[in-house]
């Protein structure tokens, strides 16, 4: 099977149209959520089969898995199918909807499960929480699947931030059904430690009376034995834990730690493993890119986010123009650094109702005793354009002039247009654009000034009209990245009285 584009992951724009093609030596078909969407199937002269799936007017709800498979009953040798995952980042869609049965997760053993909360944008940071808790749980997240790990019988929700609003998923309920088979879970106080620090691992088994724990670990293979401690936890019956404690870890202690548990009554056994990394010294690493120029719109709130990895936990400081920032009492600035997994952090600077004065040079610095990293960017405050003045005058030269003045950030573009038939314009007749072309009896002169204190551009444009023989509606439109504004004036011939 050949899929075009090949993926395996695509990020597409909302409202766009996209074409997926799959071809193979036998009839092929596209599948989406176990259904076959409308598609065009064809057979080429060379015997190749193809199917074209056209996705139109994409929304966030089109996010998900797409499969191309062979579509015949001859039962080909290979059960081949190609998987493609499409993201359609859509700020209007929070978490993708789940079927009711996906919200209830039943288990008969302690096993890894997935809480299937998914978002439309692979760049979003998603965190998992107990339903009644604020603390993010250190569980790995896959944007295509959700959070995977070993979960207690509790209720969980996922959270993400889209723009400046926090979005919660539906609640997911995990129920463990008691069975007598042996179930082991292994966790570590930390899976990353510096040399000289301690490694502490815990292996837990619930519901079995007589169990034997056996650990295998890197140090054991070199003949250096560590004696585990068995602890009978007292919160519920038969909650037994083996603790393996390695003081003063060395680089050679990195590797896989396996706990094998056997119970003699039914001769059941289970084992679980965990990887431990011993690093020479701590680290801080930026994840992803943050552009050196960032934008915020005047009077809107803006959150600037930096994602990084660090061990041990770092101190995070934000600076503006080399001055340290802190949460302001007036609530204009909010700083937060969240630990989204054991070594992953998200630091956010939120500017509430942005002011012009908040433009400038921002730096985030994350550091501890072993390492530091800093990230800087310039914040530009975008101001929607507004036309401040549109006036007409009759100089002695006989020509008529119209002057338009406006401001905005980034620099506004100016568009002049005119309409000669006042009765039909602009509803029935589109206005004519005016400019410096030789055909038009008009000339333009535009000056741009940057006002440092207000941090915005002022545009002054003068339109010279050579001879006006009947009333003319002249419109000045200013446009920039964050808006547009228009004013119009009626210009009458010299000979006509007002």
């Amino acid at each position: 099977l050949v899929v075009t584009p090949p993926g395996p992951e695509l990020v597409l724009n909302v409202s766009s149209t996209f074409v997926l093609t799959c071809s193979g030596s036998a009839p092929v078909v596209w599948e989406r959520m176990s259904q076959e969407p409308p598609q065009e199937m064809a057979k080429a002269q060379d015997g190749t089969f193809s199917s074209v799936l056209t996705l139109t007017n994409l929304t966030g709800l089109d996010t998900g898995e797409y499969f191309c498979t062979h579509n015949d009953s001859r039962g080909l040798e290979t059960d081949e199918r190609k998987r493609l995952y499409i993201f359609v980042p859509d700020p209007t869609v929070g978490f993708l909807p789940n079927d009711a049965e996906e919200l209830f997760i039943f288990l008969t053993e302690i096993t890894e499960i997935t809480i299937p909360c998914r978002v439309t944008d692979p760049q979003l940071v998603v965190t998992l929480h107990e339903k009644k808790g604020d603390v993010a749980l250190p569980v790995p997240y896959d944007h295509q699947r959700g959070f995977s790990g070993i979960f207690e019988d509790r209720s969980y929700i996922c959270k993400t931030t889209i723009g400046d609003r926090e979005v919660d998923s539906d609640a997911y309920y995990v129920y463990r059904l008691q069975v007598s088979s042996i179930n082991v879970s292994v966790n570590a106080v930390q899976t990353v430690v510096r040399q000289g620090e301690n490694i502490t691992l815990m292996c837990i088994v619930i519901g079995n009376e007589v169990v034997n724990f056996e650990w295998t670990y890197p140090r054991k293979e070199s003949g250096r034995l560590v004696e585990p401690v068995t602890d009978f936890l007292l919160d519920m019956p038969y909650h037994i834990r083996s603790i393996l404690h390695i003081p003063s870890a060395e680089l050679e202690d990195s590797g896989t730690y396996t706990c094998n548990v056997t119970e003699s009554v039914n001769d059941h056994q289970d084992e679980k493993a965990i990887n431990i990394t011993v690093v020479e010294s701590g680290y801080v690493r930026l994840l992803g890119e943050v552009g050196t120029l960032q934008f915020a719109e005047l009077h809107r709130s803006r959150t600037l986010q930096v994602v990084f990895e660090a061990y041990p936990p770092p101190t995070v400081l934000w600076f503006k123009d080399n001055r340290t920032l802190g949460d302001s009492s007036a609530g204009e600035i909010a700083l937060s650094t969240r630990n989204v997994s054991e070594t992953r952090y998200v630091s956010e600077l939120t500017l509430v109702r942005v002011k012009v004065a908040e433009a400038g040079h921002y730096t985030m610095r994350a550091f501890h005793e072993d390492a530091e990293v800093q990230l800087s960017f310039q914040l530009q405050i975008n101001v929607p354009v507004r036309v401040l003045e549109l006036s007409e005058s009759h100089p002695d030269s006989g020509e008529q002039t119209v002057r338009c003045r406006g401001r905005g950030m980034p620099q506004p573009n100016i568009i002049w247009s005119a309409c000669r038939d006042l009765k039909r314009c602009p509803r029935e007749l589109p206005p004519t654009l005016l400019g410096n072309s030789s055909e038009e009896e008009s000339q333009l002169e535009t000056n741009v000034t940057y006002w440092e204190e207000e941090q915005e551009f002022e545009v002054v444009s003068t339109l010279r009209l050579q001879h006006v023989d009947r009333p003319l509606s002249v419109r000045c439109t200013l446009r920039n990245a964050v808006g547009q504004d228009t004013q119009e004036v009626i210009v009458v011939p010299h000979s006509l009285p007002f």
Epitope: V229, D231, F232, L233, L234, D235, M236, P237
Partner: antibody, heavy 119, light 106 residues
Framework: EVQLVESGGGLVQPGGSLRLSCAAS????????MAWVRQAPGKGLEWVAS????????YYRDSVKGRFTISRDNAKNTQYLQMNSLRAEDTAVYFC????????????WGQGTMVTVSS | DIQMTQSPSSLSASVGDRVTITCQAS??????IAWYQLKPGKAPRLLMR???TLESGTPSRFSGSGSGRDYTFTISSLQPEDIATYYC????????FGGGTKVEIK
């Protein structure tokens, strides 16, 4: 023969502190979780706190959390209950009890020591 | 937290009578209930665990039954040495005692 002997009870003023001890013998102390259970005059039994055999985990009833600390010294075959910020309602006979490994019910108890909190 | 409601709080019976005490949990305790006998000035004594398993040394006139939330403790033929206060305790999730039942002889 399993034996648990409590000591350290007495009269103390509200807000004061007291440290109870429980000396264990007749079994391998480090293999067993231990607990404190109390009985106020004319009232029923009430679980107070427990500690795992290694001392790695402790558990408390809500009304004593932050005020009482359970601990143990496996080398001395002794468990302790440090009681701070004592209140009149903490007046009771305090029993030392042993947890059976795994199932966790209390299988052996001491005779108890009386703690009176009064001004 | 799991609550345990024990009844009656006291009872008076004749030697040889059948005596029944009940304990109800606020949620299922999966048979994790034990029964203790407490006599003044003595250490509490474990009689029965896991609903119906008698401890060694507990006379066979004592028995237990129940499941889910509801449990019963029975003395089939009351003896003078059985005069005491009896307590149930759940150990399914931490520990909660019932209020106790004082057994007296008429």
């Amino acid at each position: 023969e399993v034996q648990l002997v409590e000591s350290g009870g007495g009269l103390v003023q509200p807000g004061g502190s007291l440290r109870l001890s429980c000396a264990a013998s007749g079994f391998t102390f480090s293999n067993y979780g231990m607990a404190w259970v109390r009985q106020a005059p004319g009232k029923g039994l009430e679980w107070v706190a427990s500690i795992t055999n290694s001392g790695g985990n402790t558990y408390y009833r809500d009304s004593v959390k932050g005020r009482f600390t359970i601990s143990r010294d496996n080398a001395k075959n002794t468990q302790y209950l440090q009681m701070n910020s004592l209140r009149a309602e903490d007046t009771a006979v305090y029993f030392c009890a042993r947890h059976t490994p795994g199932a966790n019910y209390f299988d052996y108890w001491g005779q108890g020591t009386m703690v009176t909190v009064s001004s | 937290d799991i609550q345990m409601t024990q009844s009656p709080s006291s009872l008076s019976a004749s030697v040889g009578d059948r005596v029944t005490i009940t304990c109800q949990a606020s949620q299922s305790i999966k048979n994790y209930i034990a029964w203790y006998q407490l006599k003044p000035g003595k250490a509490p004594r474990l009689l029965m665990r896991y609903t119906s398993t008698l401890e060694s040394g507990t006379p066979s006139r004592f028995s237990g039954s129940g499941s889910g939330r509801d449990y019963t403790f029975t003395i089939s033929s009351l003896q003078p040495e059985d005069i005491a206060t009896y307590y149930c305790v759940q150990y399914a999730n931490l520990y909660t005692f019932g209020g106790g039942t004082k057994v007296e002889i008429k």
